[in-house]
Interface confidence: medium
């Protein structure tokens, strides 16, 4: 069955200064490729976390994404402020050349 990206929480309420946990799981290991988290959708969406590369000091992963069989792509965002409000999407990419291709969004 084709991979699904599941974000089970419709909304997450967090007090200022606290940590937000954004849950995301994939239903399959195939296709191979990284997960990215974005705030918003469209060309102007904001990258929150990239499994493959980059430095995201406020973000930690809930599980160890380096493990081959991991399908939990949940993240924690620390020190939440009102400016962090918005809709967050967990997006699965398919490995491609030269660039990875967006495959499915939560």
């Amino acid at each position: 069955e084709e991979l699904q990206v599941i974000q089970p929480d419709k909304s997450v309420l967090v007090a200022a200064g606290e940590t937000a946990t954004l849950r995301c799981t994939a239903t399959s290991l195939i296709p191979v490729g990284p997960i990215q988290w974005f705030r918003g959708a469209g060309p102007g969406r904001e990258l929150i976390y990239n499994q493959k590369e980059g430095h995201f000091p406020r973000v930690t992963t809930v599980s160890d994404l380096t493990k081959r069989n991991n399908m939990d792509f949940s993240i924690r965002i620390g020190n939440i402020t009102p400016a962090d409000a918005g809709t967050y999407y967990c997006v699965k990419f398919r490995k491609g050349s030269p660039d990875d291709v967006e495959f499915k969004s939560g």
Epitope: G40, A41, G42, P43, G44, R45, E102
Partner: antibody, heavy 124, light 113 residues
Framework: QVQLVESGGGVVQPGRSLRLSCAAS????????MHWVRQAPGKGLEWVAV????????YYADSVKGRFTISRDNSKNTLYLQMNSLRAEDTAVYYC?????????????????WGKGTTVTVSS | DIVMTQSPDSLAVSLGERATINCKSS????????????LAWYQQKPGQPPKLLIY???TRESGVPDRFSGSGSGTDFTLTISSLQAEDVAVYYC?????????FGGGTKVEIK
């Protein structure tokens, strides 16, 4: 020729459900993202929802999130909008529209083909 | 959500004269990766669905007369009808597609003076 034809509109009571359909012809339906856009009587345009060409991604306006579901059947060249928990403010002409972005484009840049619309009236 | 503000609400122009419609977005719709503004213009005649005129702020859709032109970048955009024809009487909408939800301006009604 390229055509979109909506159906399924009508008069419905608040809290009830309705399913709109949009039949596509004249182009490769499975290669295009599709939208629903609505227009309340005498008002402007309001985007409702979009679905990717392959159904993989769906996005909704906040005003309908959790109540409306967009879906498609590429084998039938048909787009759907399941509308639940309808409210008076959902009263509008509902248009389906083709996304200019196809399977090869990440993001749309306009809606280039529109149906004539189907009217939904929510009233007790 | 990005708010799109159109001005004026309505416009009366003599046949053959220039009509100018403005659209301002509450944040930039310029995508730095491809240097394109994700802004479209539509024409809606009474009793008809909208018709795409312009995309990427200034690219004319196929089949649209060249009297229609779009300009601007970032947050400020303009639709110009260089020589108004009777068939141009309609409501014109701008729309941003940079951040979902794609949002429309309130519309500008163009009439013959």
């Amino acid at each position: 020729q390229v055509q979109l034809v909506e159906s399924g509109g009508g008069v419905v009571q608040p809290g009830r459900s309705l399913r709109l359909s949009c039949a596509a012809s004249g182009f490769t339906f499975s290669s295009y993202g599709m939208h629903w856009v609505r227009q309340a009587p005498g008002k402007g345009l309001e985007w409702v929802a979009v679905i990717w060409y392959d159904g993989s991604n769906k996005y909704y306006a906040d005003s309908v999130k959790g109540r409306f579901t967009i879906s498609r059947d590429n084998s039938k060249n048909t787009l759907y909008l399941q509308m639940n928990s309808l409210r008076a403010e959902d009263t509008a002409v509902y248009y389906c529209a083709r996304d200019t972005g196809s399977a090869t484009t990440m993001w749309l840049y306009g809606m280039d083909v529109w149906g004539k619309g189907t009217t939904v009236t929510v009233s007790s | 959500d990005i708010v799109m503000t159109q001005s004026p609400d309505s416009l009366a122009v003599s046949l053959g004269e220039r009509a100018t419609i403005n659209c301002k977005s509450s944040q930039s719709v310029l995508y730095s990766s491809n240097n394109k503004n994700y802004l479209a213009w539509y024409q809606q005649k009474p009793g008809q669905p909208p018709k795409l005129l312009i995309y990427w702020a200034s690219t004319r859709e196929s089949g649209v007369p060249d009297r229609f032109s779009g300009s601007g970048s970032g947050t400020d955009f303009t639709l110009t009808i260089s020589s108004l024809q009777a068939e141009d009487v309609a409501v014109y909408y701008c729309q941003q597609l940079y951040i979902y939800p794609p949002t429309f301006g309130g519309g500008t009604k163009v009439e013959i003076k």
